[in-house]
């Protein structure tokens, strides 16, 4: 069945943008003037997820890349990772659950809780340049909430 | 306050145009997935479709081909260009703005515009 | 396409009267259901999300259950300001999105 997508680029409530560093991996760090150009475009597809109350899921891949965030257990942690996909059955309305987020959204603020592993969120350092995790605390110091932007084609 | 304010409506002739628009205030539309939905002289609700960003708009089967939502974020403004206009496209047009993106609920709407199809 | 069928068209009743609307899907759609009231000549408002939220500033007599394909909407005590017309309506992410066809309350 068909899945209702968008385009969109993510800022976390620094303003830090997110971009690729590296193949498999994204880092945040502020950027202006043409360097947005830099930040990362996702797809953030609706997909199929366990109910609870004003959670949504969605999968987040890159767009026009056959890559998707996913959680795995990596050393015994949750990790968040880019993993590569054929591009023939992604995105689907029934996606694995390592590619599902629950995402929250109050205030214009959003959160992305990794359905496989509850309370774990998408997470960025206070400080620059430093790769995008999952993170398993809320309100500390890392960065759990985010800022979506469409993006004009 | 934020709210929305639809117009454009008015009469037109079978195969006609019109374009009808919606502006918001109280907040930007660039950040919001709005919705058209219409309502036939004492029908129900149809949904004709949503627009998140420019290439992303979902239709009504119906509405496919003839109906086109596109955005104005300069001017904060959403637009329904309906084309090859018919009798039974006879209806208040209202614009609504999605609650949550994806939660497919509309919790702010406009107050309507009306269009009259025929000859 | 889903389809969303509403039942009764219309129904009767009274202040301080319980009162039961129900949907129903022609396939499965989880919890993703809303519910609308709508006055003569005014827009729809959201009244219940997710099947059983209540959206902000709705009273508390509105409540709703279901998932998969039955759904209901109940008013507890039915007040003067109730009498109109409720839809329900599929929603989350999916391609298409129906309404039910409609409730009439009368008093």
């Known amino acids: 069945a068909p899945v209702r997508s968008l385009n969109c680029t993510l800022r976390d409530s620094q303003q830090k943008s997110l971009v690729m560093s590296g193949p498999y991996e994204l880092k945040a760090l502020h950027l202006q003037g043409q360097d947005m150009e830099q930040q990362v475009v996702f797809s953030m597809s609706f997909v199929q997820g366990e109910e609870s109350n004003d959670k949504i899921p969605v999968a987040l891949g890159l767009k026009e890349k056959n890559l998707y965030l996913s959680c795995v257990l990596k050393d015994d942690k949750p990790t968040l990772q880019l993993e590569s996909v054929d591009p023939k059955n992604y995105p689907k309305k029934k996606m694995e659950k390592r590619f599902v987020f629950n995402k929250i959204e109050i205030n214009n603020k959003l959160e992305f809780e990794s359905a496989q592993f509850p309370n774990w969120y998408i997470s960025t350092s206070q400080a620059e340049n430093m790769p995008v995790f999952l993170g398993g605390t809320k309100g500390g110091q890392d960065i759990t909430d985010f800022t979506m932007q469409f993006v004009s084609s | 306050e934020v709210q929305l304010v639809e117009s454009g409506g008015g009469n037109v002739q079978p195969g006609g145009s019109l374009r009808l628009s919606c502006t918001a205030s109280?907040?930007?539309?660039?950040?919001?997935?709005m919705a058209w939905v219409r309502q036939a002289p004492g029908k129900g609700l149809e949904w004709v479709g949503i627009?998140?960003?420019?290439?992303?708009?979902f239709y009504a089967s119906w509405a496919k081909g003839r109906f086109t939502i596109s955005r104005d974020n300069s001017k904060n403004t959403l637009y329904l260009q309906m084309n090859s206009l018919r009798a039974e496209d006879t209806a208040t047009y209202y614009c609504?703005?999605?609650?949550?993106?994806?939660?497919?609920?509309?919790?702010?709407w406009g107050q309507g515009t009306t269009v009259t199809v025929s000859s | 396409e889903i389809v969303m069928t509403q039942s009764p068209s219309t129904l009767s009743a009274s202040v301080g009267d319980r009162v039961t609307i129900t949907c129903q899907a022609s396939?499965?759609?989880?919890?993703?259901l809303s519910w609308y009231q709508q006055k003569p000549g005014k827009a729809p408002k959201l009244l219940i999300y997710?099947?059983?939220t209540l959206a902000s500033g709705v009273p508390s007599r509105f409540s709703g259950s279901g998932s998969g394909t039955e759904f209901t909407l109940t008013i507890s005590s039915l007040q003067p300001d109730d009498f109109a017309t409720y839809y329900c309506q599929n929603a989350g992410g999916g391609v298409s999105i129906a309404f039910g066809q409609g409730t009439k309350l009368t008093v």
């Open positions: 609504a703005r999605e609650r949550n993106i994806f939660s497919g609920d509309m919790a702010l």
């Open positions: 997710k099947a059983s």
């Open positions: 627009i998140y960003d420019s290439a992303s708009t």
């Open positions: 396939q499965s759609i989880s919890s993703w």
């Open positions: 109280g907040f930007s539309l660039s950040d919001a997935a």
